[in-house]
Amino acid sequence: ARPMGYFELQLSALRNVNGELLSGACCDGDGRTTRAGGCGHDECDTYVRVCLKEYQAKVTPTGPCSYGHGATPVLGGNSFYLPPAGAAGDRARARARAGGDQDPGLVVIPFQFAWPRSFTLIVEAWDWDNDTTPNEELLIERVSHAGMINPEDRWKSLHFSGHVAHLELQIRVRCDENYYSATCNKFCRPRNDFFGHYTCDQYGNKACMDGWMGKECKEAVCKQGCNLLHGGCTVPGECRCSYGWQGRFCDECVPYPGCVHGSCVEPWQCNCETNWGGLLCDKDLNYCGSHHPCTNGGTCINAEPDQYRCTCPDGYSGRNCEKAEHACTSNPCANGGSCHEVPSGFECHCPSGWSGPTCALDIDECASNPCAAGGTCVDQVDGFECICPEQWVGATCQLDANECEGKPCLNAFSCKNLIGGYYCDCIPGWKGINCHINVNDCRGQCQHGGTCKDLVNGYQCVCPRGFGGRHCELERDECASSPCHSGGLCEDLADGFHCHCPQGFSGPLCEVDVDLCEPSPCRNGARCYNLEGDYYCACPDDFGGKNCSVPREPCPGGACRVIDGCGSDAGPGMPGTAASGVCGPHGRCVSQPGGNFSCICDSGFTGTYCHENIDDCLGQPCRNGGTCIDEVDAFRCFCPSGWEGELCDTNPNDCLPDPCHSRGRCYDLVNDFYCACDDGWKGKTCHSREFQCDAYTCSNGGTCYDSGDTFRCACPPGWKGSTCAVAKNSSCLPNPCVNGGTCVGSGASFSCICRDGWEGRTCT
């Protein structure tokens, strides 16, 4: 099976100056030791074995390599150097591979489990001897490292000074190309088929390709506006209608086949329009209303569908009352007109203001434009009325109005009536036809860059920091508000203030904690810990003081009290030969005069008998919630998610590579990022449209309303459908446009907008 990731170790240097084995013997195995005359030049044939296992606070070199193991070929003699990992080394190795060479110093250990981040690494240098299998006699050096590493491309350098040899190497963990996360157990492989249409982002999340959506990016994004209740799509950009629905957006029901003067709300209905009946709404129930067949004032009565009867007034007869008998008997002339019988029937003589065959038409008295001064004429029965502009009155707007009666002047002493107008006498500070505009009294009175605010017949200066007074002419004490943090001293200046910060702080307000350990002030090898506005030096046993520069008296108050010497007597009068082990496994006993002793402790241990491991975590060196693990003469920080580095003080840039789509700007956060989206976009990575509506969403002047992930069109009169593309007009019912054409109706006429590949009046 394919690995989830790889642990890579690149050996870059090994120095075995004496060319000896860990046992002290020479590599060539002829019994010589370094002490007995030294070993020869390049006697060792050095190769390296690597063992990777679970994290052990106290490393045990034995036991299985539970995470994997590997080995190099023979890399060189007593000492050798290889190109280091990183850019320069990668180039050198690429050249070597191009020449057909393998990379000798690289050990790659694949793993098929979630990377646990913590690990133990044991590196052994061996002398190769083709006569023997590896045994402890041929071991040159064994070094170990227990720690934590996150998957990334960067290499981490490790240096080891062993008993015999010095090793330099780099390590890293990399996820396989389709695995992601800090543990390499999140699988994502880009694909573009029915199982999903996606690429993978930097975190291994599926990023849908254009036109696809859903958790697995299998669902097609249908045409915008498609009514997903009655339609859908299997490929992007389509809108395929369910049975019984039609139209570009599947928002029109299919009426009953052959339905003439009817419509549907649900498919296969034929709901008749007013005055139409029958299964197909093709029977005219109001022949009278739609055809008006009865003439000469005859009354029409609807009979059976498509049938009618005329009841004729006196003097008329015929199916449609078209035959005149005694025409004037029925007083056909309206509005006081006089009737005269003529051979064809009758004639009406109309009074003033009326016209037409029966004096039913009102004559337009506004035709002569009687209204003066731009007045609007309204025709009335036998007359007219003028609607005058504000400044004029009278029947034909010929008289000047007194505008002052309406009190138009707002901030004035008086109002004067003029011909066709008026005049307002303004109070100081106001201007305009109605004294409604405040005069700008600001004319550069404010000093020292003050901002002028206009008032009624006056002004006010808004002064910059450090100034006051009516014209900002007075200097203010900026230090009065104690703006300096961390005990900084404030100095008032002409244009503000300046903070003089105490040691350990900087910034305009002394708000920045300076790293006082750069460069380290600690002496005699003491470790420096940066504190807020201060630092702490962890002094070795024999030095004290703030900077560990003061030597300590090893035995305060006099000579050390004798417990025992460094040796124990083997018998009376015999010198001390056997070590008593008083200094334990981490100290060396030094005999002093008078039977006294002192213990010289190994690095990392302290106390009279070197039994105490110095707690290197005391200064809480791990930042940002990192967990500190004390080790011998060292500590290790296990960082929380989102932080890395030896002290958990490095926040990796989550904006690389840029996760923001649609020109969004990325801001790096802790183990996260924020995309500031461009106008019109939203979502974690600016991948969603902010607004569903644009100028083209609703047709025919419809108003679009955004409702989250969809939209609604409010249609103007005469239009319906989800995008106002369906005419209510009967000229489009039933739809005369075939082959998917869209009908656009206007009154009794219509036109068809045909789909690609079709043309003609009805897209035939």
Epitope: A1, P190, N192, D193, T199, T234, V235, R240
Partner: antibody, heavy 123, light 107 residues
């Protein structure tokens, strides 16, 4: 050499169950999809369903959804088709096939097929 | 589901003939089309993938073309071993679907 070997076919009564296995060898099992395709006697090919062993993602034909389940054991390099509530119309030769996929090429096709195993549903 | 309609359903041809089989998709399937050859009692064999790419080991007399909804498999010079049934298959949207097959017989 790439090989896919189906097993587990046989005669079963309507409403019964059967489990087919597809043992894969000669390639990295988690780098490919495994599909099940069936062919009724004298008829054409019909896709039944598929699995991506690397992440366990599955998909099924509408005709078998809710009755058939596809799974994979990456330690054994084997895919399984669990068939429940079998009907007479499920009678067919069942093939398992390997499908490579790549974002750069669509429709990469099923490049290796097993020899097929016959499933007969009859009373 | 997307329908894949093959034509003709069967054809008779002689050795050396140029044979063309077409496959029409009911909707746009990009270039996600593969072609297979199947002989009686045997499993299908992949010939063409991604509409026009020849699968390794397949003779160069086989070729494929098309995109969107119309696809073609062409055998430039029919050989005795080419008499078989040919299927097209789309893998653009779920479920993947096969054509009904085209049987190529000896005239």
């Amino acid at each position: 050499e790439v090989q896919l070997v189906e097993s587990g076919g046989g005669l079963v009564q309507p409403g019964g169950s059967l489990r087919l296995s597809c043992a894969a060898s000669g390639f990295t099992f988690t780098s490919y999809d495994i599909h099940w395709v069936r062919q009724a006697p004298g008829k054409g090919l019909e896709w039944v369903g598929g699995i991506s062993p690397a992440d366990g993602d599955t998909d099924y034909a509408n005709s078998v959804k809710g009755r058939f389940t596809i799974s994979a054991d990456t330690s054994k390099n084997t895919a399984y088709l669990q068939m429940n509530s079998l009907r007479a119309e499920d009678t067919a030769v069942y093939y398992c096939a390997r499908n490579d996929y790549d974002v750069r090429s669509v429709g990469s096709g099923m490049d290796y097929w097993g020899q097929g195993t016959l499933v007969t549903v009859s009373s | 589901d997307i329908q894949m309609t093959q034509s003709p359903s069967s054809l008779s041809a002689s050795v050396g003939d140029r044979v063309t089989i077409t496959c029409r998709a009911s909707q746009d399937v990009s270039t996600a089309v593969a072609w297979y050859q199947q002989k009686p009692g045997k499993a299908p064999k992949l010939l063409i993938y991604s509409a026009s790419f020849l699968y390794s080991g397949v003779p160069s007399r086989f070729s494929g073309s098309g995109s969107g909804t119309d696809f073609t498999l062409t055998i430039s010079s029919l050989q005795p071993e080419d008499f078989a049934t040919y299927y097209c298959q789309q893998s653009w949207t779920a479920p993947p679907t096969f054509g009904q097959g085209t049987k190529v017989e000896i005239k």
